[in-house]
């Protein structure tokens, strides 16, 4: 039974040209995290593998930095970075948990600082079924 929940930074806004930290936290489970995938819509941004370390997708190599922790730092933000981001936690023995973050990149005069809040997102909708695509779970 999957008991864990994913807490995320929720809906966040940031300034164009600035940077932002995408952060998820898995709690209420003793499952071992084996890999975390960070995705934007259907595009892979990065992988953090417990055994092998980080992989940053080449199309983001100049603008994405690993960390802090299992999080991801997006730099040199553009308006095109606005959208949904997903942290997909692969765990053993629980299976897969998915968290969602919505990022809005605004012109610097409009962006609100400190507009971060946490939305717990439960990851109980599916088990470790490799044939299912994570984005079916919003």
């Amino acid at each position: 039974m999957m008991t864990g929940t994913i807490e995320t930074t929720g809906n966040i806004s940031a300034e164009k040209g600035g940077s932002i930290i995408l952060q998820c936290h898995l709690s209420s489970t003793t499952a071992q995290v084996t890999q975390v995938n960070w995705e934007q819509q259907d595009q892979l941004l990065a992988i953090c593998n417990a055994d092998l370390g980080w992989h940053i997708s080449p199309s983001f190599k100049d603008r994405v930095a690993p960390g802090p922790g299992l999080g991801l730092t997006l730099q040199s933000l553009t308006v095109n970075d606005t959208g949904e981001y997903f942290c997909i936690y692969h765990t053993y023995p629980d299976g897969t948990y998915t968290g969602r973050i919505f990022l809005e990149v605004l012109e610097s005069s409009v962006a609100e600082h400190g507009a971060r809040f946490q939305i717990p997102i439960e990851g109980r909708d599916y088990k470790d079924d490799d044939d299912k695509h994570h984005h079916h779970h919003h």
Partner: antibody
Framework: EVQLVESGGGLVKPGGSLRLSCAAS????????MSWVRQAPGKGLEWVGR??????????DYAAPVKGRFTISRDDSKDTLYLLMNSLKTEDTAVYYC????????????WGQGTLVTVSS | SYELTQPPSVSVSPGQTASITCSGD??????GCWYQQKPGQSPILVIY???KRPSGIPERFSGSNSGNTATLTISGTQAMDEADYYC?????????FGGGTKLTVL
């Protein structure tokens, strides 16, 4: 020590089929993205296709010349990669290598010796 | 289809610096990798993710990738570096190899 051992090559007639295997050891195979690369006699390297880890969807990508004819699969419980080749053509004659995609700093390794596939009537 | 272009051959004197280029449309948006292959042997990865060296590869091998060009640089080239070198464009959807460059150490 990372090791890849390819097998299953041989002589096959045009239009025939062959299945290659690659036995992996010395690393966590299930997390690796794996590719097949071939090299025709006296020619350069040509990427055939890849399969991602199950934790990245386990999806496959193929080069245009083999798409629809070749199928890559993996058995993580056996640490083995496969390449099923159907409708073989003479131009598929090559040494076939299985390789680890260079995703992670902690997982780069040597290629195997390859297995020779000869398509001839 | 995506293509990578390498010079067929490059010559260098021992101790000098050899540079092998690889060009492709927006190659800098992908990862550039380089492989060394000596006659009768399997290829060896010498540079991955543009500029990283696998363990066991000498420091004289370095790489860069920007714009439309990736470059493999061998400083203080040695006779043992004579080989074919292949560039590779890598991303999460496809992989492409260049045609190869024969490096001759005069």
């Amino acid at each position: 020590e990372v090791q890849l051992v390819e097998s299953g090559g041989g002589l096959v007639k045009p239009g025939g089929s062959l299945r290659l295997s690659c036995a992996a050891s010395g690393f966590t195979f299930s997390y690796a993205w794996m590719s097949w690369v071939r090299q025709a006699p006296g020619k350069g390297l040509e990427w055939v296709g890849r399969i991602k880890s199950k934790t990245n969807g386990g999806t496959t990508d193929y080069a245009a010349p083999v798409k629809g004819r070749f199928t890559i699969s993996r058995d993580d419980s056996k640490d083995t990669l496969y390449l099923l080749m159907n409708s073989l053509k003479t131009e598929d004659t090559a040494v076939y290598y299985c390789t680890i995609d260079p995703l992670y700093d902690l997982l780069t390794g040597p290629w195997g010796q390859g297995t020779l596939v000869t398509v001839s009537s | 289809s995506y293509e990578l272009t390498q010079p067929p051959s490059v010559s260098v004197s021992p101790g000098q610096t050899a540079s092998i280029t690889c060009s492709g449309d927006k190659l800098g948006d992908k990862y550039g990798c380089w492989y060394q292959q000596k006659p009768g042997q399997s290829p060896i990865l010498v540079i991955y993710q543009d500029s990283k060296r696998p363990s066991g590869i000498p420091e004289r091998f370095s790489g860069s990738n920007s714009g439309n060009t990736a470059t493999l640089t061998i400083s203080g080239t040695q006779a043992m570096d004579e080989a074919d070198y292949y560039c590779q464009a890598w991303d999460s959807s496809t992989v492409v190899f260049g045609g190869g460059t024969k490096l001759t150490v005069l």
